[in-house]
Interface confidence: medium
């Protein structure tokens, strides 16, 4: 932002109404009327460049110096061409020299030379020429110079002429201050710019109305350079929620429209599924039946639960079970759904039912599932089965109603043994079998049938209660064919898969695990 | 030494016209801003016109404006002054007046200009 | 235009007199003002511009004062050569005006 000036002298806008102090009295220095763009101007000038050495002093008027550290000073004027007088003026001179002195008090008319302080000699940039001088072509230079620190109440400042034809036009002595500022959504109020070039004032700023530091940012800070320039800004504010920024300040959000927390970003719409908000809202309630989960921003549409898995299928393999279901229908306006599956069984003579699940194996854990199937193994055979599939989303746990879709189920086989050769030799093989532990009380013998591969004549078939045999009296180096069958009260189980074990031939005898 | 020295006047009727010359010499014609001025017969001096150094800008008094036109010559260090639709109250000693700045000792011009240096003048009359 | 106003239209005096003419504007003109000096058949001659600087080779016994609306012209210790009618004219607008002159003769 452009630094601000605050005048403390200005000779033009005076009006020739000032009344400076000329040195010696009489001579030298004068003030005089011009006409300029048809308004007349005042100016002090001197033109004594033929009359030798020169010392011709203008002291201003003693300036209140205020609040001011560092004072800047403008000049405005002409200097003519040493050139364009008779000869030259071989004691002409094209510059001046200009001086201050601080004072606590005003001396008025007690004037002295020692007291004053030079600040530079002041040349111009462009000298009048004959030409222009006839053509009433004012070459005006602009010069600045600056003092600082001022420490008392007051100073004056003067002008030596050394024999120049020179007029002053111009004289302004200001002070720059930062202005007063909004930026970053903070305040800064106006602030006197320092008196050394190399420092920063450091100003911190308050936060507009309605607006606030952002968690773990910094607060607003800017810095009043010497210049009057706010540089470097630090941190920032925010518009709070339920405001939004709006040139520079903070306005509630409009009826319809929220804003939840402090940021950047505008008030939004409320979106589907809300109720209309109120202005300044931070967030939208849900219409009645739909909800919104904890870890839902406030931008999200409310929700509610899914509709139950649209269509749900139990195919019995044995003793496994298969379950697959489709999405619900009504997925709630929600993508986080998961599925549960629960599990009861019955027994077909007692009717009497219970829960399932410690006896029963999942293929993947069964609640939290997000695919569509699963599979259910270690069935009882001759046991009924009801499977329950839930489906859930993240607003379910807000209401007390559930979105679920059953499937029973009749397992008549015990499943299939896992058939394993413990060890073989030239006429024997020993064969071991396994079925889930909730099966085996129900089977009462296992039945292993084997015959020679190739031979569709004949076969044999060895009864046993326990979970292993060993088949003998057959032929070295022979493959042949082995399953194993399970035998409950009701019949017959399922049959293990067709294992083909080879015996030993006669040179590679002994009897070897495989 | 500064030498100006007019001529050109004479005897003319109501409605005629006249050239009037000034002829400059001993200093540097091209520095200088030069104007007519007139005095009528035991009347006061009257500023007739103007020219800038090197032929701009021209100004007219109010009396002459549309009638006479000041122009100059640098090469020949020659002004003029041509007077058309001559009227009787034009009837004047004619002075050409010349103005250089640089025994001007002072920081900014005058917004106008006074006359440093005189011809001797060339009486116009204008009757029928 | 300016009007330029001068006292007395004529005056009489003595070699050795001092003598001041006055010359008024009709408006402030700062200090632009000159003074020329007249002899019969002859042409003016500049005194003094800028109201009180004197033109080069002109006596010191002639001296210009005053600002604004205001201005003289003093002649200290009138000399012989020194009676004659004497103007003033403003250079403060393009539309330069004479006084109406003050003739000086001799008492």
């Known amino acids: 932002a452009q630094g601000k000036e605050v005048v403390l002298l200005d000779f033009a806008a005076a009006g020739g109404e000032l009344g400076w102090l000329t040195h010696p009295y009489g001579k030298g220095w004068d003030l005089m009327q011009n006409i300029m763009n048809d308004m007349p101007i005042y100016m002090y000038s001197v033109c004594n460049v033929m009359s030798g050495d020169q010392d011709n002093w203008l002291r201003t008027n003693w300036v209140y110096r205020g609040e001011a550290e560092r004072i800047f000073i403008e000049l405005k004027f002409t200097v003519r061409d040493c050139n364009s007088f008779p000869g030259g003026a071989s004691s002409c001179k094209e510059t001046f020299n200009l001086y201050y002195a601080e004072s606590d008090l005003d001396y008025g008319t007690n004037f002295q030379k020692r007291l004053f302080t030079k600040i530079d000699t002041i040349a111009p940039d462009e000298i009048t020429v004959s030409s222009d001088f006839e053509a009433r072509h004012v070459k005006l230079n602009v010069e600045e110079r600056s003092v600082g620190p001022l420490t008392r109440k007051g100073f004056y400042l003067a002008f030596q002429d050394i024999g120049a034809c020179v007029a002053l036009l111009s004289v302004r002595v200001y002070y720059k201050k930062c202005p007063e500022l909004l930026q970053g959504l903070a305040h800064f109020p106006e602030t006197i710019a320092g008196s050394d070039a190399p420092s920063l004032a450091t100003v911190a700023g308050t936060c507009v109305d309605h607006a606030v530091v952002p968690p773990g940012g910094e607060e607003p800070r800017m810095h009043c350079a010497v210049d009057g320039e706010w540089l470097v800004p630090i941190g920032q504010c925010l518009c709070q929620a339920g405001y939004e920024k709006v040139e520079d300040a903070c306005q509630a959000c409009s009826p319809g429209f929220f804003k939840f927390e402090a940021s950047e970003s505008p008030c939004l719409e409320c979106p589907e599924h809300t109720l209309p908000s109120p202005e300044g809202a931070t967030s939208c309630e849900c219409e009645e039946g739909f909800f919104r989960a904890p870890q839902d921003p406030a931008s999200m549409p409310c929700t509610r639960p899914p509709s139950a898995p649209h269509y749900l299928t139990a195919v019995g393999m044995g003793a496994k079970v298969e379950l697959r279901w489709t999405p619900p229908q009504d997925s709630g306006g929600r993508e986080d759904i998961v599925y549960s599956v629960t599990c009861e069984q019955c027994w077909p003579e007692s009717g009497e039912c219970g829960p399932c699940e410690a006896s029963v194996r999942y293929s993947e854990p069964p609640h939290g599932l997000t695919r569509t199937s699963v599979t259910v193994s270690d069935l009882e055979p001759h046991m009924n089965y009801t499977f329950t599939v839930e489906a859930r989303n993240g607003v379910s746990g807000l209401v007390t109603s559930r979105s679920f879709r059953t499937a029973s189920v009749s397992i008549n086989q015990t499943e299939p043994p896992k058939v394993r050769l413990e060890g073989r030799s030239t006429t024997s093989l020993s064969v071991s079998w396994s079925i889930p532990p909730p099966q085996q009380s129900r089977v009462w013998k296992y039945e292993v049938t084997y015959r020679k591969k190739g031979d569709s004549n004949s076969y044999n078939v060895r009864r046993t209660e326990g979970f292993s045999v060993t088949l003998d009296d057959l032929a070295p180096d022979t493959t042949y064919l082995v399953q194993v069958q399970a035998l409950t009260q009701e019949g017959q189980g399922a049959g293990s898969k067709v294992h083909e074990f080879q015996t030993l031939s006669p040179e590679g005898s002994g009897n070897l695990a495989v | 030494e500064v030498q100006l020295l007019e001529s050109g006047g004479g005897l003319v009727q109501p409605g005629g016209s006249l050239r009037l010359s000034c002829a400059a010499s001993?200093?540097?014609?091209?520095?200088?801003?030069m104007a007519w001025v007139r005095q009528a017969p035991g009347k006061g001096l009257e500023w007739v016109s103007r020219?800038?150094?090197?032929?701009?800008?021209?100004h007219y008094a109010d009396s002459v404006k549309g009638r006479f036109t000041i122009s100059r010559d640098n090469s020949k260090n020659t002004l003029y002054l041509q007077m058309n639709s001559l009227r009787a109250e034009d009837t004047a000693v004619y002075y050409c007046a010349g103005y250089d700045s640089g025994y001007d000792y002072v920081a900014v011009a005058g917004p106008a200009e006074y006359f440093q240096h005189w011809g001797q003048g060339t009486l116009v009359t204008v009757s029928s | 235009d300016i009007q330029m106003t001068q006292s007395p239209s004529s005056l009489s005096a003595s070699v050795g007199d001092r003598v001041t003419i006055t010359c008024r504007a009709s408006?402030?003109?700062?200090?632009?003002l000159a003074w020329y000096q007249q002899k019969p058949g002859k042409a003016p001659k500049l005194l003094i511009y800028?109201?009180?600087n004197l033109h080069t080779g002109v006596p010191s016994r002639f001296s210009g004062s005053g600002s604004g609306t205001e201005f003289s012209l003093t002649i200290s210790g009138l000399q012989p050569d020194d009676f004659a009618t004497y103007y003033c004219q403003q250079y403060n607008q393009y539309s330069r005006t004479f006084g109406q002159g003050t003739k000086v003769e001799i008492k």
């Open positions: 001993g200093f540097t014609f091209s520095h200088y801003m």
């Open positions: 408006q402030s003109i700062s200090t632009w």
């Open positions: 020219i800038g150094p090197s032929g701009g800008p021209t």
């Open positions: 800028k109201a009180s």
